[in-house]
Amino acid sequence: CKAMHVAQPAVVLASSRGIASFVCEYASPGKATEVRVTVLRQADSQVTEVCAATYMMGNELTFLDDSICTGTSSGNQVNLTIQGLRAMDTGLYICKVELMYPPPYYLGIGNGTQIYVIDPEPCPDSDF
């Protein structure tokens, strides 16, 4: 396994609709055709997998239909969007990139993006 540098923003604020987007960029040293991107969430020293997608260079990322993630790829950049976030989902979201095929296998893990999610204030009842 060979190491690879992965860069991602330090902080992102989710929108009022619970959507957060960030770019995950990797310094590809090889000529991979198949790339796997995984988003991990770290909170309270627990790491869980949020979503993952394997894609062919030059093609679109395809997450599973029930995934909370969507994304697009362009060169060595992956634009990730996570939706359906609530305040309790605030945490460090780590981008992991693997150059799967052909050999050599490269693995890169970003430092993480701290996503802050603030639940919107409920609208007060109106008498109108």
Epitope: K31, T54, M56, Y101, P102, P103, Y105
Partner: antibody, heavy 125, light 107 residues
Framework: EVQLVESGGGLVQPGGSLRLSCAAS????????MHWVRQAPGKGLEWVSY????????YYADSVKGRFTISRDNSKNTLYLQMNSLRAEDTAVYYC??????????????????WGQGTLVTVSS | DIQMTQSPSSLSASVGDRVTITCQAS??????LNWYQQKPGKAPKLLIY???NLETGVPSRFSGSGSGTDFTFTISSLQPEDIATYYC?????????FGQGTKVEIK
């Protein structure tokens, strides 16, 4: 027993089409990268195409790009090669091959460790 | 594309002889090289992977070495059943390419 069995070869006229199949058994088909390799009569081996385990990633040799399509049906444990616009120079024995991937914490090992018996494709008028 | 140049294209040796085949890549492929044996009318068989690792079940008289662009395949003591054509293959850049093959015969 781990096995690959090709079928679908035969005689076809130039410009015609043919679909080769490769039936896999004895292993978890969807976990493996698969390839097609061909060998013209009396010649050496030529790599043709590959497909990832999920089918999401493919690649072709320049000599067949735009004419051949590799695909797989993991529910049927079968690999396919759709060959269109066939030329005389496509005449060969076509082999499907499994690219095994041994994964451990240190290394990932590749190599075509299982091959089919081959199916002959003859393109001639 | 990476070109793989194998030599010799054919050789004749006696039973018990040491046989050496070389394979040269047109650019650095690290150790991502495999060696295959193909007997007449049969499918190829993987003998050596990653330049020097013996595939399970392959006799220890077969060995491989090298890294970068220059690789060597050796049969330490040629046996009658080793009559075949041997191919090297690079496995790190698409399209994967094979050497042109070395036909080994018994004198």
């Amino acid at each position: 027993e781990v096995q690959l069995v090709e079928s679908g070869g035969g005689l076809v006229q130039p410009g015609g089409s043919l679909r080769l199949s490769c039936a896999a058994s004895g292993f978890t088909f969807s976990s493996y990268y698969m390839h097609w390799v061909r060998q013209a009569p009396g010649k050496g081996l030529e790599w043709v195409s590959y497909i990832s385990g999920s089918g999401s990633s493919t690649y072709y040799a320049d000599s067949v790009k735009g004419r051949f399509t590799i695909s797989r049906d993991n529910s049927k444990n079968t690999l396919y090669l759709q060959m269109n616009s066939l030329r005389a120079e496509d005449t060969a024995v076509y082999y499907c091959a499994r690219d095994r991937m041994l994964v451990d914490s240190v290394n990932r090992v590749f190599g075509f460790d299982v091959w089919g018996q081959g199916t002959l494709v003859t393109v001639s008028s | 594309d990476i070109q793989m140049t194998q030599s010799p294209s054919s050789l004749s040796a006696s039973v018990g002889d040491r046989v050496t085949i070389t394979c040269q890549a047109s650019q650095d492929i690290s150790n991502y090289l495999n060696w295959y044996q193909q007997k007449p009318g049969k499918a190829p068989k993987l003998l050596i992977y990653d330049a020097s690792n013996l595939e399970t079940g392959v006799p220890s008289r077969f060995s491989g070495s090298g890294s970068g662009t220059d690789f060597t395949f050796t049969i330490s003591s040629l046996q009658p059943e080793d009559i075949a054509t041997y191919y090297c293959q690079q496995h790190t850049n698409f399209p994967f390419t094979f050497g042109q093959g070395t036909k080994v015969e018994i004198k």
